[in-house]
């Protein structure tokens, strides 16, 4: 049984969203007393991998030289010290992009929008998909996650924004996916630049921040007003 040892830290470099064919390294950091590190993948009955610790024994490296569908999923790690096994780490969700062809992202009526007005970002896939994600550059999380109800497959998802403020300005991409694996995404769409011109007074100034600063408004889920799109997609905010 898991003992009272502190849980290790689990992370991926260069990140947890990896394009097909690219390399990724999963790191598990425990304590200097660790004798073995074990990486478990959700739904795998045996350990996914196990490794000797790297000197000075407080971490282990699990290398994936070429990302494929098989590696996408949810991982946890543990370490063993002389007193027993640690608690599991928080989960790491390793997502692969490039599983499907890229969708098209467009803005209706236009990517040039006046502050206070409405705009809808439209993500369209060539083949029917049941999940669509909208990503804003430099945002920490997906802005919107639209999933169809009852497995119904759609060719598109609408992401309405109203009223638009300067915070909405920036570069967007979207991904599409099938519900049977939340860890497999399409290639990213080509980027769409949303330009907000300020005719109405902005309730919030546009943030000027670097990646290393504390989270600002663009890290928060986008909460568009208006009705759920008529696409049969249920809206999920993350």
């Amino acid at each position: 049984q898991a003992g009272p040892l502190p849980k290790p830290t689990l992370w991926a470099e260069p990140g947890s969203v990896i394009s097909w064919g690219n390399s990724v390294t999963i790191w598990c950091q425990g304590t200097l007393e660790a004798r073995e590190y074990r990486l478990d993948k959700e739904e795998s009955p045996a350990p996914w991998d196990r490794q000797n610790p790297l000197e000075p024994k407080n971490k282990a490296r699990f290398s994936i030289p070429s990302m494929t569908e098989d590696y996408a999923g949810r991982y946890r790690c543990y370490y063993r010290s002389p007193v027993g096994w640690s608690q599991p780490s928080d989960p790491l969700e390793l997502v692969m992009t490039g599983a499907y062809s890229k969708p098209t992202l467009s803005a209706l009526p236009s990517p040039l929008v006046t502050s206070g007005k409405s705009v809808t970002l439209l993500c369209q896939s060539r083949s029917p998909m049941d999940t669509f994600l909208l990503i804003k550059e430099r945002a920490a999380h997906p802005l919107l996650h639209l999933r169809s109800e009852h497995g119904a497959q759609q060719h598109q998802a609408e992401f309405p924004m109203s009223p638009v403020t300067s915070v909405h300005g920036g570069t967007y991409r979207c991904f599409s996916s099938h519900g049977f694996s939340h860890y497999l995404l399409s290639h990213p769409s080509d980027p769409l630049e949303l330009i907000v011109s300020g005719s109405l007074e902005d309730p919030r100034p546009s943030p000027t921040r670097s990646v290393s600063t504390a989270a600002g408004p663009e890290d928060q889920p986008l909460m568009p007003t208006g009705s759920v799109p008529h696409s049969g997609l249920r809206r999920h905010w993350e």
């Epitope: 049984q1 073995e36 350990p47 996914w48 991998d49 590696y71 543990y78 063993r80 027993g84």
Partner: antibody, heavy 121, light 107 residues
């Protein structure tokens, strides 16, 4: 019945390579790590390495890292060990063994009958 | 690598006798030790793992004990079918290593 069926005796020349097989039956092949163990005539046991059949992850004894290559074929539930640049020191019986995890612990619960490799000119 | 030293390397014992084989590790292996029995021309058979846990189907006359660097395998009452070579294995650290073996013969 859970079984590991190993390939037959191999007589090979020095410098050559050989690929030994271990066919699993009676269980889900991808759910258990497979280990390989060497035993020279009249001598003890040496752990060569292990492989996870579900993803091909391996751990090797450093001593065998340039000698042995472990692979699997999921479609035929077979584990393989290729031995390269053979010398008389590689003449031995090679066993495959399945490890079962019980919580955080594991043990060898099934062994193959072994494959005898003789290296001779 | 961790070195396991078994003793004795060979021994004779009588039927019904209590037999103890020891395995000493070159460092603390945290009870990550297994015991195996091998008969001539046969594959090894696992008897005990984690120092003292008996595998299903292994007769209860076999028992394991020890901790740290020192471990033992005991047969409480020797039977004829117990003859063979006994090996210990540490799996505390890579590479896993076996002891040199103890050959047990019947007097």
């Amino acid at each position: 019945e859970v079984q590991l069926q190993q390939s037959g005796t191999e007589l090979v020349k020095p410098g050559a390579s050989v690929k030994l097989s271990c066919k699993a039956s009676g269980y889900t092949f991808t759910n258990y790590w497979m280990h390989w163990v060497k035993q020279r005539p009249g001598q003890g046991l040496e752990w060569i390495g292990e492989i996870n059949p579900s993803n091909g992850r391996t751990n090797y004894n450093e001593k065998f890292k340039t000698k042995a290559t472990l692979t699997v074929d999921k479609s035929s539930s077979t584990a393989y060990m290729q031995l390269s640049s053979l010398t008389s020191e590689d003449s031995a019986v090679y066993y495959c063994a399945r490890s079962t995890y019980y919580g955080y612990d594991w043990y060898f619960d099934v062994w193959g009958a072994g494959t005898t490799v003789t290296v001779s000119s | 690598d961790i070195v396991l030293t078994q003793s004795p390397s060979s021994m004779y014992a009588s039927l019904g006798e209590r037999v103890t084989i020891t395995c000493k590790a070159s460092q603390d292996i945290n009870s990550y030790l297994s015991w195996f029995q091998q008969k001539p021309g046969k594959s090894p058979k696992t008897l005990i793992y984690r120092a003292n846990r008996l595998l299903d189907g292994v007769p209860s006359r076999f028992s394991g004990g020890g901790s740290g660097q020192d471990y033992s395998l005991t047969i409480s009452s020797l039977e004829h079918e117990d003859m063979g070579i006994y090996y210990c294995l540490q799996c505390d650290e890579f590479p896993h290593t076996f002891g040199g073996g103890t050959k047990l013969e019947i007097k």
